[in-house]
Interface confidence: medium
Amino acid sequence: GELETSDVVTVVLGQDAKLPCFYRGDSGEQVGQVAWARVDAGEGAQELALLHSKYGLHVSPAYEGRVEQPPPPRNPLDGSVLLRNAVQADEGEYECRVSTFPAGSFQARLRLRVLVHHHHHH
């Protein structure tokens, strides 16, 4: 199997950012857990959330109330999450690490860009 994601996700300030992470598995493979983390260079990884295939979403305290699963229907191979109300400080590198059985672990990175629209007065 392999992970499908985007190299760059671009969102306007204040919008919700969908961070995609889909496991394209072979027949019979299942996703056990998806771990999302902020992994900007020079800083330690900061956990966003753990998406457990069986139990659902655990959001780390730093992101409480800001990370959600996309609305149903959900594919059990889809580890995507929503980052609510993006702010400029959210811009950076994110990693999803997917534990599958029986194939093992896969990981992928993406960059989140947050656009700030300036209003011009004439």
Partner: antibody
């Protein structure tokens, strides 16, 4: 012998609180997810809550979210379920179970009865 | 959310007879399915995991089969201690099937 010994059930009034305990022995407790599953009188099995081996990740059924708190003390090999704001519909036998994480519940406690009634 | 439907709800049989219990998933769960046995006043007990593997200490008269959406638990020759309620569950869901009660005819 691998076993789970439960305690802490009883009769409580609506709005009250109760804490259930589940003492584990015979296996490396911190290596396993643990779950609470309940069974209302005459009904089927309903998963309530789960916690990862380290205790860092916790999960809840929508029906108990915000009212119940799962925790564990790995130094004491004990699992807990703190139940607040109890309702009549929480009346059930509560089972703790060792959980293979992504698989199945292979070891179960004998259950403890929680009755919520005025 | 995958829904597991068990049938029949009740199965009335005599000791020595063969019991066939069905569990149907609303979408494919591959072979990641378990069966539990529960006797009155007791905790559930894991019987079968991964659709066809017997858990430790489970007698050979219990067997599981199926994959995808249709699964079967077979008890080849019912013993007195087998009269109980049986639940199916798939690995990446917290939901259990509604159960099948096997009672003495």
């Amino acid at each position: 012998e691998v076993q789970l010994v439960q305690s802490g059930g009883g009769l409580v009034k609506p709005g009250g609180s109760l804490r259930l305990s589940c003492a584990a022995s015979g296996f490396t407790f911190s290596d396993y997810y643990m779950s609470w599953v309940r069974q209302a009188p005459g009904k089927g099995l309903e998963w309530v809550s789960a916690i990862s081996g380290s205790g860092g990740s916790t999960y809840y059924a929508d029906s108990v979210k915000g009212r119940f708190t799962i925790s564990r003390d790995n130094s004491k090999n004990t699992l807990y379920l703190q139940m607040n704001s109890l309702r009549a519909e929480d009346t059930a036998v509560y089972y703790c179970a060792r959980d293979e994480g992504y698989y199945y519940m292979d070891v179960w406690g004998k259950g403890t009865t929680v009755t919520v009634s005025s | 959310e995958i829904v597991l439907t068990q049938s029949p709800a009740t199965l009335s049989l005599s000791p020595g007879e063969r019991a066939t219990l069905s569990c149907r998933a609303s979408q494919s769960v591959s072979s990641y399915l378990a069966w539990y046995q529960q006797k009155p006043g007791q905790a559930p007990r894991l019987l079968i995991y991964d659709a066809s593997n017997r858990a430790t200490g489970i007698p050979a008269r219990f067997s599981g089969s199926g994959s995808g959406t249709d699964f079967t638990l077979t008890i080849s020759s019912l013993q007195a201690e087998d009269f109980a309620t049986y639940y199916c569950q798939q690995s990446y869901s917290t939901r259990f099937g509604g159960g099948t009660k096997v009672e003495i005819k």
